[in-house]
Interface confidence: medium
């Protein structure tokens, strides 16, 4: 089948990095500068992606593969193939329509991207707050308040060793 196809279509013999030039009797011509063809049998070469503005070149364009971009420092990639760059904020902030803004009280963000999220509500799990939350860090939940009643240790004691032959209750 490949043989009959190549007899019918001389373009199928053109490898990646070339195109089938109709103006030159369907001769395989190399892709011009700043263009590429990643598969054989192409009738045109594609224009290379240009990484400009906040985009920087991660991988140069070659005759057989497109350029790849990432973002300059202070930005991170969004979208398939890094089609967008989003400005970083500091930890404890989120990006809003007014730029980077501090997280509201009761919320935190421990990354340079994304939104501020509410602190964990320890009481929902029947636990108490061991370490208070900040703009950058979530609260740390500790033992339940009942475990911290007078006379009770705030450190959970190790489980008693089971005697052989006794199954747990």
């Amino acid at each position: 089948f490949e043989r009959t196809r190549s007899l019918q279509d001389p373009c199928s013999n053109c490898p990646a990095g070339t195109f089938c030039d109709n103006n030159r009797n369907q001769i395989c011509s190399p892709c011009p500068p700043n263009s590429f063809s990643s598969a054989g049998g192409q009738r045109t070469c594609d224009i290379c992606r240009q990484c400009k503005g906040v985009f920087r070149t991660r991988k140069e364009c070659s005759s057989t593969s497109n350029a790849e971009c990432d973002c300059t420092p202070g930005f991170h990639c969004l979208g398939a193939g890094c089609s967008m760059c989003e400005q970083d904020c500091k930890q404890g902030q989120e990006l809003t329509k007014k730029g980077c803004k501090d997280c509201c009280f009761g919320t935190f963000n421990d990354q340079k991207r994304g939104i501020c999220r509410p602190w964990t509500n320890c009481s929902l799990d029947g636990k108490s707050v061991l370490v208070n939350g900040t703009k950058e860090r979530d609260v740390v939940c500790g033992p339940s308040p009942a475990d911290l009643s007078p006379g009770a240790s705030s450190v959970t004691p190790p489980a008693p060793a089971r005697e052989p032959g006794h199954s747990p209750q």
């Epitope: 400005q87 990006l95 980077c100």
Partner: nanobody, 122 residues
């Protein structure tokens, strides 16, 4: 071909004023959202201000009340009026044709000028 050419930068004393201009060509300026961004020495690029085709404006908190973005569609020109300048405003200021309409987010099809240097120093 899209072209953006900034001008108006220079050396100014703290508390002084400058007006940056960005002459645009090669696209329909009046229907395009536009932005100013800046890059301080040794720092990353920071979004400063944006203006939609409707005229709605946004500013980063640090320049609010001091900077004013505006546009003259008849002249295909974007402006940034900068008052009460501070040392921390020292940066290369870039004008950009802005597609995403999301503050702080840039698309690969956005276009950028070459920038104009603003130095605030006594």
């Amino acid at each position: 071909e899209v072209q953006l050419l900034e001008s108006g930068g220079g050396l100014v004393q703290p508390g002084g004023s400058l007006r940056l201009s960005c002459a645009a060509s090669g696209f329909t300026f009046s229907s395009s959202a536009m932005s100013w961004a800046r890059q301080a020495p040794g720092k990353g690029l920071e979004w400063v201000s944006s203006i939609y085709s409707s005229g709605k404006t946004y500013y980063v908190e640090s320049v609010k009340g001091r900077f004013t973005i505006s546009r003259d569609n008849s002249k295909n020109t974007l402006y940034l009026q900068m008052n009460s300048l501070r040392a921390e405003d020292t940066a290369v200021y870039y004008c950009a044709k802005w597609k995403t309409l999301r503050v702080g987010v840039w698309d690969e099809s956005d276009y950028w000028g070459q920038g104009t240097l603003v130095t605030v120093s006594s």
